[in-house]
């Protein structure tokens, strides 16, 4: 094959080599960029900056080598468009620092920075940590800071990510209230801070206020959906990023739903209860308190992390005719009480049938369901205890 006269020449099926002295000052308009998996650049003294726009369109890039060139600055977001990058060699350039943000989100198996005039500061604390933890092949490079000695020896006592404190209201929050949250940010070299509110959706109207070091957030006209939702404050400095999540508990009355009994491995009377604080539950059978035993007891499903509603079963193990009757679930919290009832028939009474009739075996539960979801104030009803005497 004839020698390639261009600044950059194909290398293999999806590689590109740019080694002609001083031919590049940026990486715009590289030929066949969208399919490149490997890019090798050498001896490019005029290539001093690597920025987001330089690598746009290189979505398939796996290996990037820029060596013996003039690289002085790599933007924190330079590799945003190259999420598959796994090997990055920037050795023998003019880099004094490299932000932690540059490599965040990448799964780098190899990062080579030897031969750069690195300046030891807290901004390289992340790289020092990689060296300590044996990541990316960094320890083998024995990185030096220009005129300061080994990177490994850099003092790091004062190199911490920001410290965050989020203040939430002490008092009970009710549906329709406005809630003010404040995030206090402390630390050196603060760069950015903000709120992450992705979970909130329609749970409240959001208004942000203030800036570093004190960020305010007003959640107006809150709904009960706000419960179990994370409100996250974040802040960044040259060392890294910190996040703190809080949840606002919005009080609302107990509610309850009962469903027709179903036969599984055992019988189950399905229920759903909601309320904040979580309501206490009490079962009645034909109007009398039902004490739970190994034959009849409440089982909860695993709760969803982001909602207050609890689903479960009144589990009945091999129920007989003596278990036929009216089941009522009472749910109560300080803001109200609700109840729901359902008739269940598990088996005919073997002692009550006409001798001329066929012998009954069993039949499905009667489908009678009455639910009163509206809370009723009954302060004298106390939640039941969990320890009962028998005998």
């Amino acid at each position: 094959a004839a020698p390639c006269p261009d600044a950059c020449c194909p290398h293999g099926s999806s590689g590109l080599r740019c080694t002609r002295d001083g031919a590049l000052d940026s990486l715009h308009h590289l030929p066949g960029a969208e399919n490149l998996t490997e890019l090798y650049i050498e001896n490019q003294q005029h290539l001093q900056h690597l920025e987001l726009r330089d690598l746009r369109g290189l979505g398939e890039l796996r290996n990037l080598t820029i060596v013996k060139s003039g690289l002085r600055f790599v933007a924190p977001d330079a590799f945003h468009f190259t999420p598959r990058l796994s090997r990055l060699n920037l050795s023998f350039n003019a880099l004094e620092s490299l932000s932690w943000k540059t490599v965040q989100g990448l799964s780098l198996q190899e990062l080579v920075l030897s031969g750069n005039p690195l300046h030891c500061s807290c901004a390289l604390r992340w790289l020092q940590r990689w060296e300590e933890e044996g990541l990316g092949g960094v320890p083998e490079q024995k990185l030096q800071c220009h005129g300061q000695g080994p990177l490994a020896h850099m003092p790091n006592a004062s190199c911490g990510v920001p410290t965050l404190k989020v203040q939430v209201p002490n008092a009970s929050v009710d549906v329709g209230d406005d809630v003010l949250l404040r995030c206090q940010v402390e630390g050196r070299g603060l760069e950015q801070a903000g709120w992450i509110l992705t979970e909130l959706e329609q749970s409240a109207t959001v208004m942000k206020s203030g800036g570093l070091p004190s960020l305010g957030l007003t959640l107006a006209n809150v709904t009960s959906d706000l419960n179990r939702k994370n409100v996250t404050c974040w802040a960044e400095n040259d060392v890294g990023r910190a996040e703190v999540s809080v949840q606002v508990n919005v009080s609302f009355p107990a509610s309850v739903q009962l469903h027709t009994a179903v036969e599984m491995h055992h019988w189950c009377i399905p229920f759903s209860v909601d309320g904040q604080p979580a309501p206490s539950l009490r079962w009645l059978f034909n109007g009398s308190v039902l004490n739970e035993t190994s034959f009849i007891f409440t089982e909860f499903l695993e709760p969803a992390a982001n909602e207050t509603v609890r689903h479960g079963c009144l589990r009945l193990n091999q129920p007989t005719h003596v278990n036929n009757g009216n089941y009522t679930l009472l749910a109560a919290n300080p803001f109200g009480q609700a109840s729901a009832s359902i008739m269940a028939a598990f088996m005919d009474n073997p002692f009550e049938f006409n001798p001329e009739d066929p012998i009954p075996v069993s039949f499905s539960p009667v489908d009678t369901n009455s639910t009163s979801g509206d809370p009723v104030e009954k302060k004298d009803e106390t939640p039941f205890g969990v320890s009962v005497a028998v005998g």
Epitope: H266, E292, V388
Partner: antibody
Framework: QVQLQQSGAELMKPGASVKISCKTT????????IEWVKQRPGHGLEWLGE????????NYNENFRGKATFTADTSSNTAYVQLSSLTSEDSAVYFC??????????WGAGTTVTVSS | QAVVTQESALTTSPGETVTLTCRSS?????????ANWVQEKPDHLFTGLIG???NRPPGVPARFSGSLIGDKAALTITGAQTEDEAIYFC?????????FGGGTKLTVL
């Protein structure tokens, strides 16, 4: 495979308390009731009560209320019974059993408690 | 509290069928008593044989069966074997607690 491993034999003084453990393996501890049973020669088997570890629901046989206290540690999958104010009447072998109604279930090997001055 | 009564001892021969019974002081034993039968062998080795009157858990030989006979719960061993020599306890459920019978010592010779 469901297994219940009980703690070793205990020799106690009258008036003392003893705590017997029942470590379970092979199933989801929090979801099944644990029964406690006492066996004394000449007195057969007596049911002390039951506990549902995941919810802390406890049912005591009235004859043993105040004598036996059931607890459970879901982090170690272990159930406990504490017997207080021991007398010679409490000398017995104590069993835990995992119940899966209507089956009384899988039994531990028993813990012998001897009360003697 | 209810009293559960069993035969104190029974003797059978290998291959024979033997029935152990269990009576309740409160009246007829019903399916709501969830009669269980538990076998005790030497060194406090307990095994559940029957639960809920007539349910056999996995691993229990088919020669063991449970039923209600008249007003009593019954355990029948069809084709007894020498290894069935043991004490058999009946356990009945009374709404919120279990009561054990005194046990039947079964000898197979």
């Amino acid at each position: 495979q469901v297994q219940l491993q009980q703690s070793g034999a205990e020799l106690m003084k009258p008036g003392a308390s003893v705590k017997i453990s029942c470590k379970t393996t092979g199933y989801r501890f929090s979801s099944y009731w644990i029964e406690w049973v006492k066996q004394r020669p000449g007195h057969g088997l007596e049911w002390l009560g039951e506990i549902l570890p995941g919810r802390g629901i406890i049912n005591y046989n009235e004859n043993f209320r105040g004598k036996a206290t059931f607890t459970a540690d879901t982090s170690s999958n272990t159930a406990y019974v504490q017997l207080s104010s021991l007398t010679s009447e409490d000398s017995a072998v104590y069993f835990c059993a995992r119940t899966d109604p209507p089956y009384f279930g899988v039994w531990g090997a028993g813990t012998t408690v001897t009360v003697s001055s | 509290q209810a009293v559960v009564t069993q035969e104190s001892a029974l003797t059978t021969s290998p291959g024979e069928t033997v029935t152990l019974t269990c009576r309740s002081s409160t009246g007829a034993v019903t399916i709501s008593n969830y009669a269980n039968w538990v076998q005790e062998k030497p060194d406090h080795l307990f095994t559940g044989l029957i639960g809920g009157t007539n349910n056999r858990p996995p691993g229990v030989p088919a020669r063991f069966s449970g039923s209600l006979i008249g007003d009593k719960a019954a355990l029948t061993i069809t084709g007894a074997q020498t290894e069935d020599e043991a004490i058999y306890f009946c356990v009945l459920w009374y709404s919120n607690h279990w009561v054990f019978g005194g046990g039947t010592k079964l000898t197979v010779l």
